[in-house]
Amino acid sequence: SIPWNLERITPPRYRADEYQPPDGGSLVEVYLLDTSIQSDHREIEGRVMVTDFENVPEEDGTRFHRQASKCDSHGTHLAGVVSGRDAGVAKGASMRSLRVLNCQGKGTVSGTLIGLEFIRKSQLVQPVGPLVVLLPLAGGYSRVLNAACQRLARAGVVLVTAAGNFRDDACLYSPASAPEVITVGATNAQDQPVTLGTLGTNFGRCVDLFAPGEDIIGASSDCSTCFVSQSGTSQAAAHVAGIAAMMLSAEPELTLAELRQRLIHFSAKDVINEAWFPEDQRVLTPNLVAALPPSTHENLYFQ
Amino acid sequence: GAMGQEDEDGDYEELVLALRSEEDGLAEAPEHGTTATFHRCAKDPWRLPGTYVVVLKEETHLSQSERTARRLQAQAARRGYLTKILHVFHGLLPGFLVKMSGDLLELALKLPHVDYIEEDSSVFAQ
């Protein structure tokens, strides 16, 4: 049966025994800035082009053992959530991956900046259709990272990022705090904000909307046919990147403002239990869970 | 995220250094009274001191960025400091990434075209 997260974002008309919007997102390219990925995994083979971009810090610790499947874990799962054949949101989207996070999932602001610059230069050299950039990472507030995101957004690129897993105000983190970026928090199958150990999803006015981010089934780098469940605001952001790809594929001329408006318009409203958030943040945090447009848009989204 | 709201720096640390001295006889001295600012991550364990993103003013050309980077290296060398330019930015933001001692920040902030300097910091998979 359909995984809970795909059912949650799917309009009622499509809640059959499977989720298969034909060719969703085929006009859009999604850039993923993350770890290395297992690009020949059965779930994503032929859908992800691994660019030659790599800018990562050395792994911490003298006894660190670099195991390929672990190095690829985070990025492979997210690529699967965005465009995987069986558990992906936008099954028609093609992706390009840039490695900005090392085998421990750690990167730098500077490496991310150089990655964003690489995307801009690629866009200028070979203009394609709409671009979505997925940034499933977070660091402390960074003026320069936010500025780079602003410039890329002004160049017509849609940026989607994780709100952060610190159970804190997303405005204290980047790129989550960049106003031009679509910042995504995580909810679970009960529409509760996701708890992650002692922490959980970030919140506050810098979050644009929430999306499924707990127990998300996706491609596992443990083997070429494996699946695994992962949780986090990265997984939530990957859902929104997939939804954005489908919306842009159906309406390639959408501006960032129009896309943001549509994401909000089609979201489920007031379903999140706000008691989880600190009292002073409840009114500031959007009570929105991302969803695909309803069946009235069938000709646009499911052609 | 969340458009239409003014930026909030939160705990973000900002160190403003006024540009007073005209030392080193800069050919392109900054306009009188302008200040370049220094920023670093508020979360101490995430800081990466020793690597800095020098962001130049918006309309700065690549050649000017390269010249500014070279000037920084020359002035640092005169003070006995080794520096390494790791990357010159152009396309999104003008500027450069430099590996250098934090002792040189005051000097770097006085360079022409400099808008602000940010210490590098870590980002993490979420």
Epitope: E18, Q20, P22, Q38, S39, D40, R42, E45, G46, V48, M49, V50, A68, R85, D86, K91, C223, S224, T225 | -
Partner: antibody, heavy 115, light 110 residues
Framework: EVQLVQSGAEVKKPGASVKVSCKAS????????ISWVRQAPGQGLEWMGW????????NYAQKLQGRGTMTTDPSTSTAYMELRSLRSDDTAVYYC????????WGQGTTVTVSS | ESALTQPASVSGSPGQSITISCTGT?????????VSWYQQHPGKAPKLMIY???NRPSGVSNRFSGSKSGNTASLTISGLQAEDEADYYC?????????FGGGTKLTVLG
């Protein structure tokens, strides 16, 4: 143009081994593994397994476990399938195909096992 | 894993439509969006005709279409032509491997 070019026909005695090669070109190797499929005379297609150009990982069909080895050499863009302890019922045309999706196929290599 | 079940043969006259079924279980055809169909002429390598249930690779005639309901996938060929005479194989993911159908011989009459 995406192409898979296989090595030539082989005649082997029972108990011997055979190694078939498959040279890939025209696409980004690491985006796809290589599947191996065989077809005995007058029979249907049988999936034997898959091998990665990215990291050399393999996924063998249960029936093949222990008797077959699939490898890749990214430096020459070539995948290999070795079958040991050959029996007469291993007589077949062996195909390589691109990825699990098997959207592009090699021309086939006839392996005859006969005493 | 057992082969998927296909009719051994089907036939039709030029211009007609025919459908070939491919029945599996919830662990293969019913559980994945990845059913493919291959055409094979005698002495030739198989050729991909349909992938991911209903998608056609570029260069394949739109007379070929695929669908799926529950544990059964179907290939429909409309406007039958003499060159369509061939063997047709379905294929599906399983949890860890791939499985083919036994094959269907399509004969174009007359």
């Amino acid at each position: 143009e995406v192409q898979l070019v296989q090595s030539g026909a082989e005649v082997k005695k029972p108990g011997a081994s055979v190694k078939v090669s498959c040279k890939a070109s025209g696409y980004t190797l690491t985006s796809y593994g290589i599947s191996w499929v065989r077809q005995a005379p007058g029979q249907g297609l049988e999936w034997m397994g898959w091998v990665s150009f990215y990291n050399g990982n393999t996924n063998y069909a249960q029936k093949l476990q222990g008797r077959g080895t699939m490898t890749t050499d990214p430096s020459t863009s070539t995948a290999y399938m070795e079958l040991r302890s050959l029996r007469s019922d291993d007589t077949a045309v062996y195909y390589c195909a691109r990825g699990y999706g098997m959207d592009v196929w090699g021309q086939g290599t006839t392996v005859t096992v006969s005493s | 894993e057992s082969a998927l079940t296909q009719p051994a043969s089907v036939s039709g006259s030029p211009g007609q439509s025919i459908t070939i079924s491919c029945t599996g279980t919830s662990s293969d055809v019913g559980g994945y969006n990845s059913v493919s169909w291959y055409q094979q002429h005698p002495g030739k390598a198989p050729k991909l005709m349909i992938y991911e249930v209903s998608n056609r690779p570029s260069g394949v005639s739109n007379r070929f279409s695929g669908s799926k309901s529950g544990n059964t996938a179907s290939l429909t060929i409309s406007g039958l032509q003499a060159e369509d005479e061939a063997d047709y194989y379905c294929n599906s993911y399983t949890s860890t491997s791939m499985v083919f159908g036994g094959g269907t011989k399509l004969t174009v009459l007359g």
